[in-house]
Amino acid sequence: ELCDDDPPEIPHATFKAMAYKEGTMLNCECKRGFRRIKSGSLYMLCTGNSSHSSWDNQCQCTSSATRNTTKQVTPQPEEQKERKTTEMQSPMQPVDQASLPGHCREPPPWENEATERIYHFVVGQMVYYQCVQGYRALHRGPAESVCKMTHGKTRWTQPQLICTGEMETSQFPGEEKPQASPEGRPESETSCLVTTTDFQIQTEMAATMETSIFTTEYQ
């Protein structure tokens, strides 16, 4: 089951998955001036069995020099500022990324790949947050988010992280509280099952990775 929405956005923070659950899909996107080959895959798919997971399909890009690449025909309803990547980070492989059963590692880059990666996450996926350069973390709880299934709908838990500028003197500037999360309620108050596949194993894994999750600066 794909997660309906993307992981929450935290001001001045990026997120990264350490491993991708089977069923995750990655768009085959090409950088400007290149396009997916006609017969090429639209997506890579994390698939596997109990002992081994890997990415199916290969992304391939070819030059689109012969094509007219200026394609917008009407103004977008509201021009978007350049997208800051969150789930679409440049590929990087933490040194001590564990081989989690039922998970794929970060796929290797392909030739002329776009600078941002677009993932479609599945229920049970966990992502980890870190403040961008120049901001420091004020933790109120786990700096991670998990895609859960509740009452037949998917939702991401709210990471308990605030990123504040180095020069800020106030501990919680501007009353920037993370939005209330259903995590605050005891499970007994909800009448339906909450699916959190692999939550325990990934939480344990997070502790060992804390220092190596964000070894690469993102632009």
Partner: nanobody, 126 residues
């Protein structure tokens, strides 16, 4: 010249239904991902739903899942958004969009879409 033309918008009471259409010319929908976005007055554009031509991935915003259905008629070069159980907060201008790559969804997902329609107004009264 590429054109995406939306239709089917209008005024409807809460709980009612509307079916939006998006007719494409100048491109073929059978090799494009099709999406719907919406923008309410004073708010940012919001992703609603997207579906690729191979039907590998269909994505919905959590706020509309279970109420809205995106579909497409590749032969007729038309996309649809069936909207049921409409709420006042669904009031917005709805835009059809298309791109050559796979589905892009989420908060700032509009940027990668290559083609845009002019929009159709949907107003849900309480």
């Amino acid at each position: 010249e590429v054109q995406l033309v939306e239709s089917g918008g209008g005024l409807v009471q809460a709980g009612g239904s509307l079916r939006l259409s998006c007719a494409a010319s100048g491109i073929t929908f059978n090799d494009h991902t099709m999406a719907w976005f919406r923008q309410a007055p004073g708010k940012e554009r919001e992703f609603v739903a997207a579906r690729d031509w191979s039907d590998i991935i269909t994505r919905y915003a959590g706020s509309v899942k279970g109420r809205f259905t995106i579909s497409r008629d590749n032969a007729g070069n038309t996309g649809f958004l069936q909207m049921n159980s409409l709420r006042p907060e669904d009031t917005a201008v709805y835009y059809c969009a298309a791109r050559e790559g796979g589905v892009v969804a989420g908060v700032r997902s509009g940027a990668p879409y290559d083609y845009w329609g002019q929009g159709t107004q949907v107003t849900v009264s309480s």
